[in-house]
Interface confidence: medium
């Protein structure tokens, strides 16, 4: 807390420039009034205060608006908005995009910060709904958001965000979110080649069905086993023996190592031992020569 | 890598004027605040000022206001430092420095790149 | 201006010895920065915000303090380290700088 001090004769401050950074931080306090400071804020940006000085100027903005500032302020606090809390941003209320993007720039580069993300809360919020624009912008500045959203708020991101996902912005994606971002990745990437497709489309694979699947067995991809193993195994289980080795070529030495995980030891015991056994790897679990396979699932479908 | 390369200097007469050059390479030299510091022969290092990226902010240290022209040329990735009527008093090695900046752009409190220094000397 | 004074203003050491130097500010900083500077060299900085080591510095050196009191360590001198050492704060403007220790090896 900044003590109550006069401001000495001549150096109460008529504008925001330069000559406040030679001031003390008693003498910010007391030379620079709340209301002026709120409506240069633009200005802030652009002078090299020091970390403590911007302290003080935030001190001055939390007295002239207790229950939170307005839209007006908060557009243009730049490098400021680092000063501020979750509990701060908690009281404002952000509606426009423009002020949303200008914040989001501040920390541009960076993970999320507890600020970023409660200010995405407060303008989500505030807008009712999560519409395209705001989730452009925020997959711009944050790929690894769409995790954090509910399968229902997904549905209306646009495939062109997906251009921005990094492969590391998925891995806290639950399979239910990757079902839905799928089939918009498959849209987005539709036009690229064969083997360039595969490299947009993997981290997202996690939501493919299994024709899809299929498919790419006949396209000499050569799926590493991490890739594999986020497979959905509902997907997998139909896949026959050829068609799993076709998809991980070289990589399906790898299933050895797996064969006790999901969705590998589930696959397994939907294959034939003969079968399995064309791979020369000793995977064992298969279904014995000589058993009938019915697929029950198939039998429910046509009663 | 990483580079201030200065220019300019030398011996000067009392009243004349001086112009130092300080050319980055390395880095994205339009994105930084730059300064000037100069060290008198067995003195401390002595702050100048600074400018910011796109000229549009110069800060001089109180007592040099007056003395010192700071600029900068980000097409020619360049920082200048000019004065005139130059005394005794004068002489001293310039560095040219930058301002450290975090990863969200805002700058640091540190220098973190320096020049090999100018060496200036007033003299008749 | 925040005036700050180093101590000592020379000092010696023997290689593998443990060297502490001090900082003191005539009015309260945040952080402090500490540069090296040997003959015919420009500065480089040593350690940012008070206790940080800056890129390809060595292990050996560390910084600690508060307030008005700082003070910068090297764990075991080397040769190497002989050299002019000096304290910075940019706390408040005019950002200003120690007069510098100058360490010498025994």
């Known amino acids: 807390e900044v003590e109550k001090t006069a401001c000495p004769s001549g150096k109460k401050a008529r504008e925001i420039d330069e000559s406040l950074i030679f001031y003390k931080k008693w003498e910010l306090e007391a030379c620079v009034d709340a209301a002026l400071l709120a409506t240069q804020m633009d200005r802030v940006n652009a002078i090299p205060f020091t970390y403590e000085q911007l302290d003080v100027l935030k001190h001055k903005l939390d007295e002239l608006y207790p229950q939170g500032y307005p839209e007006s302020v908060i557009q243009h606090l730049g490098y400021l908005f680092l000063k501020m809390s979750p509990e701060d941003i908690r009281k404002w209320n952000v509606t426009s995009l423009e002020t949303l993007k200008a914040l989001l720039e501040v920390n541009k580069g960076h993970e999320m910060s507890p600020q970023v993300a409660t200010l995405i809360d407060r303008f989500v919020k505030g807008r009712g709904q999560l519409d395209k624009d705001t989730l452009d912008t925020l997959t711009a500045f944050y790929p690894g958001y769409l995790c954090s959203l509910s399968p229902e708020e997904l549905s209306s991101v646009p495939p062109s965000s997906i251009w921005a996902v990094r492969p590391q912005d998925l891995d806290t994606c639950d399979p239910r979110q990757l079902d839905v971002l799928y089939p918009k990745a498959r849209l987005a990437f539709q036009n690229m080649n064969g083997s360039e497709y595969f490299v947009k489309i993997q981290s997202f694979l996690g939501g493919a069905p299994t024709e899809d699947l299929k498919a790419l067995s006949q396209q000499n991809v050569s799926m590493d086993l991490a890739t594999f193993m986020k497979l959905r195994t509902d997907a997998v289980l139909p896949l026959t023996v050829a068609e799993v080795q076709k998809l991980l070529g070289p990589h399906v030495e790898g299933l050895k190592a797996e064969e006790r995980h999901r969705p590998v030891r589930d696959w397994i015991l939907r294959q034939r031992q003969d079968d399995l056994d064309t791979l020369g790897l000793g995977l064992q679990g298969g279904i014995p020569n000589g058993y009938l396979v019915l697929d029950l699932s198939m039998q429910e479908a046509l009663s | 890598q990483v580079k201030l390369k200065q220019s300019g200097g030398g011996l000067v007469q009392p009243g004349g004027s001086l112009k130092v050059s300080c050319a980055a390479s390395g880095f994205d030299f339009s994105r930084y605040w730059m300064s000037w510091v100069r060290q008198a022969p067995g003195k401390g290092l002595e702050w100048i000022g600074e400018?910011?990226?796109?000229?549009?902010?110069?800060v001089y240290t109180p007592s040099l206001k007056d003395k010192f022209i700071m600029s900068r040329d980000n097409a020619k990735n360049t920082l200048y430092l000019q004065t005139s009527k130059v005394r005794s008093a004068d002489t001293a090695l310039y560095y040219c420095?930058?301002?450290?900046?975090?990863?969200?752009?805002?700058?640091?409190?540190?220098?973190?790149?320096w020049g090999a220094g100018t060496t200036v000397t007033v003299s008749s | 201006d925040v005036v700050l004074t180093q101590s000592p203003a020379i000092m010696s050491a023997s290689p593998g010895e443990k060297v502490t130097m001090t900082c003191s500010a005539s009015s309260s900083v945040s952080y402090m920065y500490w540069g090296q500077q040997k003959p015919g060299s420009s500065p480089r900085l040593l350690i940012y915000?008070?206790?940080n080591l800056a890129s390809g510095v060595p292990v050996r050196f560390s910084g600690s303090g508060s307030g008005t009191s700082y003070s910068l360590t090297i764990s075991r001198m080397e040769a190497e380290d002989a050299a002019t050492y000096y304290c910075q704060q940019w706390s408040s403007y005019p950002p200003t700088f120690g007069g510098g220790t100058k360490l010498e090896i025994k």
């Open positions: 420095a930058r301002r450290g900046s975090h990863y969200y752009g805002y700058r640091t409190g540190y220098f973190d790149v």
């Open positions: 915000d008070t206790s």
């Open positions: 400018i910011n990226p796109d000229s549009s902010t110069i």
